[in-house]
């Protein structure tokens, strides 16, 4: 049998980091045996079979130069075999980011922090935290780990599928190459990583017979389920063309009135959505919908100073107009569990006002 | 020999935008970890943001989280930071910083000076 | 976030001098912690790495020591380039942090 180890990686290859000593091994012979070592297509000696070293060669410092495939030979002139030489550096730990579009599943993708030059591979891996009681901070013993599974296609991610909204989990994403592992763990409870995708179907039509109103409406993210549990609460913003700065108002309900639109001039509208009891963050704006006030007949209207920068239609649908009901009682405390980061969104979105 | 030069850096009105900028040399930029650190006058090191390699996933601290963006160019070798809705309390020196091998910020750059004042 | 205490806030010292820095973290970091000197003017340089690992080119006076919440970082015998202000900082989180810093001044 060889005397070489097989580290993970195509066959034939050994690797080494760039400015350390590297060891190459002679694969076709037995540990110790006196080898000849050459440079592909070079017929210089580069290490004789007298060098005390056996079956290896020593590189000392090695550089981008040293690259390449080396030879072997024993004694008697036969191929000890063929070694191609890669340098690179060990795994640094790799950066992880989780996020979730709602509040049964979450995704976590990661990114080495530096690109080690070697073929690579990642373990993915969870467990899941639950907490004893709603003021106790021990934990259960952990129950995982199971594996995170990977995306198919090879995009670096991985997807955890009926989480649960109250505990928490630690995730581990080890980055391997041939040189070493190295691991980040990190403690996420979907609570802080919930993100919802943005609402959809937003239209704004025009209210006739009154020249300063809007009416917008828009649904839930098609992957929200709804439940009684688990609503979402709505911010939208609207603008007159031309005009740099948004207003805001938060809607009760699917739609919202706008009172206090510009006569005659074409309005942008977007929305965003949230839990509606603040868990993670609001959701990115919808894309922008267009309206124009009515100019038809007029209406009475009451002041706009009075009301505001809007009003909800009376008919709301019930379940979105009356008090949304209380999520369970017994719920852990809030604060994190340790101190793993709280992970980041991918992108950050700027809200001008 | 890793060096790390920031520029953009001036004086800007509250709520103002200042893109700050590091040209890398010295080391494969494309392979390595980025990030900002600053320093407000009379107090210490801040952590600021940092990017991963490829640019996919970029982390903030809280301070300047939706304000600020950190990016990268690769083919130029040089990392930014759009700095927007600026504040009082973001003048500082901001430098430029590599990571290595999991370690954060072992190279900085010398630092350029941000100071938001009307 | 973790937060990074140091002590003392500022010492004085004589060249020739052994000196002993403390940091603690607010949580467990295991040993992610760096210590830098920052001079006034200059970029800040990194000492040690992984808590007790020398960076490459700093003289052996200086050493790091200590893993989980508490660390120590000393200076073996001060000299007048030792002088400036050394921060600890953690990366065990993807959030690093520094500590408040130790200015180090001439007695």
């Known amino acids: 049998s060889s005397p070489c180890p097989q580290a993970w990686g195509p066959p034939g290859v050994q690797y080494g980091q760039p400015g350390r000593s590297v060891k190459l091994c002679c694969p076709g012979v037995t540990a110790g045996d006196p080898v000849s070592w050459f440079r592909d297509g070079e017929p210089k000696l580069l290490q004789g079979p007298d060098s005390g070293l056996g079956h290896e060669l020593v590189l000392a410092q090695a550089d981008s130069t040293d690259e390449g495939t080396y030879i072997c030979q024993t004694l008697d002139g036969a191929l000890g075999g063929t070694v191609t030489l890669q340098l690179g550096y060990p795994p640094a730990r790799p950066v992880v980011s989780c996020q979730a579009a709602d509040y049964e599943n979450f995704s976590c993708t990661w990114s080495p922090s530096q690109i080690s030059g070697l073929p690579t591979r990642y373990l993915t891996s969870y467990r899941k935290k639950t907490v004893l009681g709603a003021d106790s901070q021990r934990r259960s013993p952990s129950t995982g780990p199971w594996p995170c599974p990977q995306d198919p296609l090879g995009a670096a991610r991985c997807v955890v599928h009926g989480a649960e909204f109250w505990s928490q989990y630690r995730i581990n994403v080890t980055e391997v190459n041939p040189l070493g592992a190295s691991t980040r763990l990190l403690d996420v409870s979907l609570q802080s990583i919930l993100r919802p995708d943005p609402p959809q179907g937003l239209r704004v039509e025009s209210v006739p017979g009154y020249p300063r109103r809007l009416h917008a409406s828009w649904t839930y993210p098609a992957s929200w389920r709804r439940q009684p549990h688990f609503l979402l609460k709505f911010r939208l913003q609207y603008r007159p063309a031309q005009h740099p700065a948004w207003s805001t108002v938060e809607p009760i309900g699917l739609e919202e009135v706008i009172t206090d639109a510009v006569a005659g001039l074409p309005h942008a509208v977007r929305v965003s959505a949230r839990d509606f009891l603040d868990a993670g963050t609001w959701s990115a704006w919808s894309p922008e919908a267009w309206g124009t006030p009515s100019t038809g007949p007029l209406q009475d209207e009451i002041p706009d100073w009075s009301q505001g920068h809007g009003q909800q239609l009376e008919a709301v649908v019930a379940q979105e107009d009356s008090p949304a009901p209380a999520r369970p009682s017994l719920q852990p405390d809030p604060r994190p569990l340790d101190h793993r980061d709280p992970l980041e969104q991918h992108h950050h979105h700027h809200h001008h006002h | 020999e890793v060096q790390l030069l920031e520029s953009g850096g001036g004086l800007v009105q509250p709520g103002g935008s200042l893109r700050l900028s590091c040209a890398a040399s010295?080391?494969?930029?494309?392979?390595?970890?980025m990030g900002w650190v600053r320093q407000a006058p009379g107090k210490g090191l801040e952590w600021v943001s940092s990017?991963?390699?490829?640019?996919?996933?970029?982390i903030y601290a809280d301070s300047v989280k939706g304000r600020f963006t950190i990016s990268r160019d690769n083919s130029k070798n040089t990392l930014y930071l759009q700095m927007n809705s600026l504040r009082a309390e973001d003048t500082a020196v901001y430098y430029c910083?590599?990571?290595?091998?999991?370690?954060?910020?072992?190279?900085w750059g010398q630092g350029t000076l941000v100071t938001v004042s009307s | 976030d973790i937060q990074m205490t140091q002590s003392p806030s500022s010492l004085s010292a004589s060249v020739g001098d052994r000196v002993t820095i403390t940091c603690q973290a607010s949580?467990?970091?295991?040993?992610?912690l760096n210590w830098y000197l920052h001079k006034p003017g200059k970029a800040p340089k990194l000492l040690i790495y992984?808590?007790?690992n020398l960076q490459t080119g700093v003289p052996s006076r200086f050493s790091g020591s200590g893993s989980g919440t508490d660390f120590t970082f000393t200076i073996t015998s001060l000299q007048p380039e030792d002088f400036g202000t050394y921060y600890c900082?953690?990366?065990?989180?993807?959030?690093?942090?520094f500590g408040p810093g130790t200015t180090v001044d001439i007695k």
């Open positions: 910083a590599r990571d290595h091998m999991g370690i954060v910020a072992t190279d």
């Open positions: 010295g080391f494969t930029f494309s392979r390595y970890m």
């Open positions: 990017i991963v390699p490829s640019g996919g996933i970029t």
């Open positions: 949580q467990d970091i295991t040993n992610y």
């Open positions: 992984d808590a007790s």
């Open positions: 900082q953690q990366y065990d989180t993807l959030h690093p942090s």
